[in-house]
């Protein structure tokens, strides 16, 4: 259930280099960019995926109101520093010695500073709100069918336990998926909600990270669910620290 033995590939991460040089000639895969070994039976961490993406050729590609502390990833792509477990390091810096603090999904949560900036801990993102707008359909989707299909998708495609899908809201054409996972709830082996959300985001954009598996074909009672816009809000266990200057 790790890397596929027959042709030595990584089913859960196409941005890898695999070879049969693991113990006993087993297939072992390493992430592009970092060279770190990855577990191909589960999702690869977002940090390693971003690093791989930056190293790859550049052509490769009842509704909830988000709280005032919700973060949106406005900064976009950067080449992150990952720790030995593949998580984001709390402090990220660019080549010009500009530094900032990030949360567990790699989204900036402070103003930018210089090399003297301190980020004491990696703050966990415990609540993610995925806000989708679907293309017009003949009628609205049945809410409970939509709810069931999205929960099943997160379980079966992204291996995220259903208990971490807190709610699915629907007011045509807006769908909101709430993922919640506190530090105390996440057991060893559990997929992180940030990683699941990132894989989902890439799937929605038609940039699937899975190897050999078809792209995302989401249907509700046979009707295709086609997304035309996605916004993801991240809520951290400790609110972010931005100066008032940014808020005006």
């Amino acid at each position: 259930h790790t890397a596929a033995q027959d042709n030595c590939t990584c089913p859960t991460n196409k941005m890898t280099v695999c070879s049969p040089d693991g113990p006993g000639g087993r297939c072992q895969c390493r992430a592009l960019g970092s060279g770190m070994a990855v577990d191909c039976s589960t999702l690869t961490s977002k940090c390693l995926l971003l690093k791989a993406r930056m190293s790859a050729p550049k052509n490769a590609r009842t509704l909830v109101r988000p709280s005032e502390h919700a973060l949106v990833d406005n900064d976009g792509l950067y080449d992150p520093d990952c720790d030995p477990e593949g998580r984001f390091k709390a402090r990220q810096c660019n080549q010009t010695s500009v530094c900032w603090c990030v949360n567990s999904v790699g989204v900036r949560r402070t103003d930018k500073g210089d090399l003297s900036l301190r980020c004491d801990e990696l703050v966990r993102t415990h609540h993610i709100l995925i806000d989708l707008r679907h293309r017009p359909t003949a009628g609205a989707f049945n809410h409970s069918d939509l709810d069931a299909e999205l929960r099943r998708l997160f379980r079966e495609r992204y291996r995220l336990h259903p208990k971490f899908v807190a709610a699915v809201h629907y007011e045509q054409p807006t769908i909101q998926i709430e993922l919640r996972q506190n530090t105390s709830q996440k057991a060893a082996g559990d997929v992180d909600i940030g990683d699941a959300a990132y894989y989902f985001e890439r799937d929605i954009k038609g940039e699937s990270l899975f190897q050999g598996r078809g792209g995302l074909d989401l249907r509700v009672r046979g009707e295709p669910l086609q997304v035309e816009r996605t916004l993801i809000y991240y809520l951290d266990e400790i609110p972010p620290k931005f100066s008032m200057k940014r808020l005006t």
Epitope: H1, P162, V165, G189, V191
Partner: antibody, heavy 118, light 109 residues
Framework: QSLEESGGDLVQPGASLTLTCKAS????????ILWVRQAPGKGLEWIGC???????TYYANWAKGRFAISKTSSTTVTLQMTSLTAADTATYFC?????????????WGPGTLVTVSS | YDMTQTPASVSEPVGGTVTIKCQAS??????LAWYQQKPGQPPKLLIY???DLESGVPSRFKGSGSGTEYTLTISDLECADAATYYC????????????FGGGTEVVVK
């Protein structure tokens, strides 16, 4: 940790019946409950599943419309069956997944017998 | 997703080896389980993730395979192994007729 089914009975064709699965010794919110049946001398047949957390239900193609799974308390799940025929005569099992995201069934009830006959 | 299991029945002497095959209609990514069922009892999980042994199951039971083809091998057969064995795809609960294979009856002579 255990599961126990109840409600099995001898019923007439066309009748409805509700089976209950009672869980003890574990928190159902961390699991899914699946219903499986076995006609006398035949193989296992998957009926459907409920994600206890969230309550989403899923059914085998043949079971859609006539079978309904629901959670009725923090420890019980029911299987409602309508328009029963002789072909529904079977031992009905409820089973629990292993708490991962796969559907490995590592805890089963002893089963309850449903007989449909006139 | 349909599961086809062969053979329907097999008979081998004590100490022998039995091989049961299971084919999925689509790739199930190694998410396959094997169960043992004896008369009057519910099934018992033997192997999960195609090849991982459930705790307490003797190492005489071995699962292998990937993609759509999977195998259960029982070596050094014992009388207690006489039972019906089922494979089950544990990948999806969407659009399926039956998650289980048809079963294989193992008779130990």
């Amino acid at each position: 940790q255990s599961l126990e089914e109840s409600g099995g009975d001898l019923v007439q064709p066309g009748a409805s019946l509700t089976l209950t699965c009672k869980a003890s010794g574990f928190d159902l919110n961390n699991y899914s409950i699946l219903w499986v049946r076995q006609a006398p001398g035949k193989g296992l047949e998957w009926i459907g599943c409920i994600y206890f957390s969230g309550g989403s239900t899923y059914y085998a193609n043949w079971a859609k419309g006539r079978f309904a799974i629901s959670k009725t308390s923090s420890t019980t799940v029911t299987l409602q069956m309508t328009s029963l025929t002789a072909a529904d005569t079977a031992t009905y099992f409820c089973a629990r997944d292993d708490g991962t995201t796969s559907y490995y069934l590592n805890l089963w009830g002893p089963g309850t017998l449903v007989t449909v006959s006139s | 997703y349909d599961m086809t299991q062969t053979p329907a029945s097999v008979s081998e002497p004590v100490g022998g080896t039995v091989t049961i095959k299971c084919q999925a209609s689509e790739d199930i990514y190694n998410l396959l389980a094997w169960y043992q069922q004896k008369p009057g009892q519910p099934p018992k999980l033997l192997i999960y993730a195609a090849s991982d042994l459930e705790s307490g199951v003797p190492s005489r039971f071995k699962g292998s395979g990937s993609g759509t083809e999977y195998t259960l091998t029982i070596s050094d057969l014992e009388c207690a192994d006489a039972a019906t064995y089922y494979c089950q795809q544990a990948y999806t609960v969407g659009n399926i007729d039956n998650a289980f294979g048809g079963g294989t009856e193992v008779v130990v002579k």
